[in-house]
Interface confidence: low
């Protein structure tokens, strides 16, 4: 670390005095201090001498000696006071620029340390400081305004009490600049716009920033629009608003509108699309197939997308039958809005009952008229089976009726012994009936089929089983001939109760 002679932290001299400051280091050394007249510099290898034969108040300041070659970057300093009875202040700069919330140093250096007790900071023309101005003083450096605010951008003077009167420094102008975090904030309203030809429309582009220096403009497609600008200041932000009012829109007004704002930090832009249409429109669509199949007991959401302008005047879900006159509960329907002109309507059908199969229609109305979208909902059922013994054309016949949806397939099994259900080990014969007779097949209802098995002689120690299956499940009915007549037995686990 370099060494300064004289080896004191502070030196007080009178104007006109000779001052010699010598710095010695291991290598070459350099002096740094306030810009002031009359200094002479002599360098001699590892020492450097700063001297003046005529010290003035302007030589007041801190002189620092550094050794550029020192890796630790050490330095030594001495503060010189040139105590001038007529000049208590040496002002190093008359303009100080800081950003908000930074500390602002007003560099008025006291030329006589004994005056420290009577110093103060004032605004020019003797005006007091603004309320909440938090400041401190250092005789070596001057006044520091802590966490400076934009509103504290003023002209200041440093005041010292000399012989009972206040002596002012020359003025120092403080400029506190707003911290501009980025380009101005933007809003463009609405985000999307549709109008019928001849209607009125309004598009509002507004930008705001903490600093007044920014530009904003609205452009249509790629043409900048000449619109008068309204300016305002509130919530500590400057606002500039451009409002485009169109009394009667036409097709040439349609297109892309961009709101663009820029400042020193850069540019922001946001866009919206304006559609002009010939007349009101109302379009209904669905992502789903309009023909739905669901297993009984399960749930389903029916969803309709609506695009409309002007807005909907009414909408509802309606059940069109055929089973009952019930209507969908409002609490099962909900609506969500993607934006002003597009909506989604959902009807939730939880745990569907047999009577809820049928047609569901969503109806919507706006000035463009009514539109409807109808879903057809068919319920799937596992088969229910029953078997009876009868005579047809004189022949003994087992008659199996199976009911379900989709249409069940039928298989007959003959097995040894009396059993509720034939297992593989017992099976003697299997007959598939690829084309059972369809007894009934109405929309939204179960399909009922009938299969006949002609049996010349019923074997009494055997079981005849009719099995039916479809994509939902299966059902069966076991027929056990007994000497006292035909006995039938449907196993419990294959009974189906919706």
């Amino acid at each position: 670390i370099p060494v300064i002679e004289p080896s004191v932290p502070e030196l007080v001299v009178k104007p006109g005095a000779t001052v010699t400051l010598r710095c010695v280091g291991n290598g070459s050394v350099e002096w740094d201090g306030p810009p002031s007249p009359h200094w002479t510099l002599y360098s001699d290898g590892s020492s450097s001498i700063l001297s003046t034969n005529n010290a003035t108040f302007q030589n007041t300041g801190t002189y620092r000696c550094t050794e550029p070659g020192d890796p630790l970057g050490g330095s030594a300093a001495i503060h010189l006071y040139v105590k001038d009875p007529a000049r208590p202040w040496n002002v190093l700069a008359q303009e100080v620029v800081v950003f908000e919330d930074q500390d602002a140093l007003l560099p008025c250096l006291l030329t006589d340390p004994v005056l420290e007790a009577g110093v103060s900071l004032v605004r020019v023309r003797g005006r007091p400081l603004m309320r909440h101005t938090n400041y401190s003083f250092s005789p070596w450096h001057g006044f520091t305004i802590h966490r400076a605010k934009f509103i504290q951008s003023q002209d200041y003077q440093c005041s010292a009490l000399m012989g009972g009167r206040k002596v002012m420094s020359i003025s120092i102008r403080l400029k506190v600049q707003k911290v501009i975090p980025g380009p101005p904030a933007l809003t463009l309203v609405p985000a999307e716009l549709v109008r019928i030809r001849g209607e009125a429309a309004q598009i509002v582009c507004s930008a705001s920033s903490v600093d007044v220096n920014f530009d904003v403009f609205l452009q249509h497609n790629n043409t900048k629009l000449a619109i008068p600008q309204q300016s305002d200041f509130h919530n500590n932000r400057y606002q500039k608003v451009l409002t485009l009012n169109l009394d009667q829109v036409d097709f040439q007004h349609a297109g892309n509108y961009s709101c663009v704002a820029s400042n020193v930090q850069g540019k922001h832009s946001t866009s919206m699309f304006f559609r002009v249409v010939e007349s009101a429109y109302l379009n209904l669509s669905s992502e789903q197939n309009l023909i739905q199949e669901v297993t009984v007991g399960e749930g389903l959401n029916l969803k309709v997308m609506v695009e409309a302008y002007p807005g909907l005047q009414g909408f509802n879900w309606t059940y069109l039958g055929p089973f009952s006159d019930h209507q969908p509960e409002p609490k099962l329907a909900n609506a969500t809005t993607k934006d002003t002109y597009r909506h989604t309507f959902t009807l939730s059908l939880p745990r569907l009952k047999p009577s809820e199969a049928g047609r569901y229609s969503f109806l919507a109305r706006n000035p463009g008229g009514w539109r409807a979208l109808t879903f057809e909902l068919t319920l799937r059922y596992p088969p229910e089976v029953s078997v009876i013994w009868t005579f047809i054309n004189g022949s003994g016949t087992l008659l199996c009726a199976a009911s379900g949806y989709p249409q069940p397939n039928v298989t007959w099994l003959q097995c040894s012994g009396h059993t509720d259900r034939c297992d593989e080990a017992q099976v003697l014969q299997v007959w598939d009936d690829p084309y059972p007779e369809v007894l009934s097949q109405e929309p939204f209802h179960k399909v009922t089929v009938q299969s006949l098995l002609t049996v010349e002689t019923l074997e009494h120690n055997q079981t005849y089983e009719c099995r039916a299956h479809n994509s939902v499940g299966s059902g069966s009915w076991a027929f056990i001939p007994i000497s006292a007549g035909a006995h039938t037995h449907p196993p419990d686990e294959f009974l189906f109760t919706p």
Epitope: E192, N256, S271, M272, F273, R275, S285, E287, K303, M305, E307, N334, A335, T336, T337, K338, R342, H343, T344, T346
Partner: antibody, heavy 119, light 111 residues
Framework: QVQLQQSGPELVKPGASVKLSCKAS????????INWVKQRPGQGLEWIGW????????KYNEKFKGKATLTVDTSSRTVYMEFHSLTSEDSAVYFC????????????WGQGTLVTVSA | KIVLTQSPASLAVSLRQRATISCRAS??????????MHWFQQKSGQPPKLLIY???NLESGVPARFSGSGSRTDFTLTIDPVEADDAATYYC?????????FGSGTKLELK
């Protein structure tokens, strides 16, 4: 069936722009939003924005405003995403994905396009 | 912005055991009775695949061993039983508020 076919991999220099495409087939093109999603190598998924083909309207993630531009060509059923002022942070796989209206999930995805930004 | 926090970041599960992945939202969301939370599966080099939509609805063609539950801020994806083909990264995603956001992902490995 619904398909989203994306353009091939791109090697681009820092500061340049790149334009990716996503061609849709198998459904009514103008009815559904096309979203774009970014995935950096070994990282998670980030939504960039959507474009609505019927009128070309867009919605962007604020983070990608000014960085990405979404456009649509209904005649070729193609959606484009142009990425500007590329840096190494933009090296990623970019997916397009189809969604319906509000709240609809991204049920169909393109295979992804790898963009590598390198000097 | 809704932040979705997934846990755990990774988990190892034995075949035919149950795997549970949690997704917590930084704020509650529930629009018109709909919860727009979706779950995706992503395997290396492939795009994400939708598994569950609106918190609990199974996407067509997805095996019934995948299920989703939850509401407001806490959501869960359950795989029971886990099969070898389920090794992948799983993401939750919210479509309720812009910007749309994804969870950070959970990597599922098989022991």
């Amino acid at each position: 069936q619904v398909q989203l076919q994306q353009s091939g991999p791109e090697l681009v220099k820092p500061g340049a722009s790149v334009k990716l495409s996503c061609k849709a087939s198998g459904y009514t093109f103008t009815t559904y939003d096309i979203n774009w999603v970014k995935q950096r190598p070994g990282q998670g998924l980030e939504w960039i924005g959507w474009v609505y083909p019927r009128d070309g309207s867009t919605k962007y993630n604020e983070k990608f405003k000014g960085k990405a531009t979404l456009t649509v060509d209904t005649s070729s059923r193609t959606v484009y995403m142009e990425f500007h002022s590329l840096t190494s942070e933009d090296s990623a796989v970019y997916f397009c994905a189809r969604s319906g209206l509000t709240g609809s999930p991204f049920a169909y995805w393109g295979q992804g396009t790898l963009v590598t930004v390198s000097a | 912005k809704i932040v979705l926090t997934q846990s755990p970041a990774s988990l190892a599960v034995s075949l035919r055991q149950r795997a549970t992945i949690s997704c917590r939202a930084s704020e509650s969301f529930d629009s018109y009775g709909n919860t727009f939370m979706h779950w995706f599966q992503q395997k290396s080099g492939q795009p994400p695949k939708l598994l569950i939509y609106r918190a609990s609805n199974l996407e067509s063609g997805v095996p019934a061993r995948f299920s989703g539950s939850g509401s407001r801020t806490d959501f869960t994806l359950t795989i029971d039983p886990v099969e070898a083909d389920d090794a992948a990264t799983y993401y939750c995603q919210q479509n309720n508020e812009y910007p749309l956001t994804f969870g950070s992902g959970t990597k599922l490995e098989l022991k």
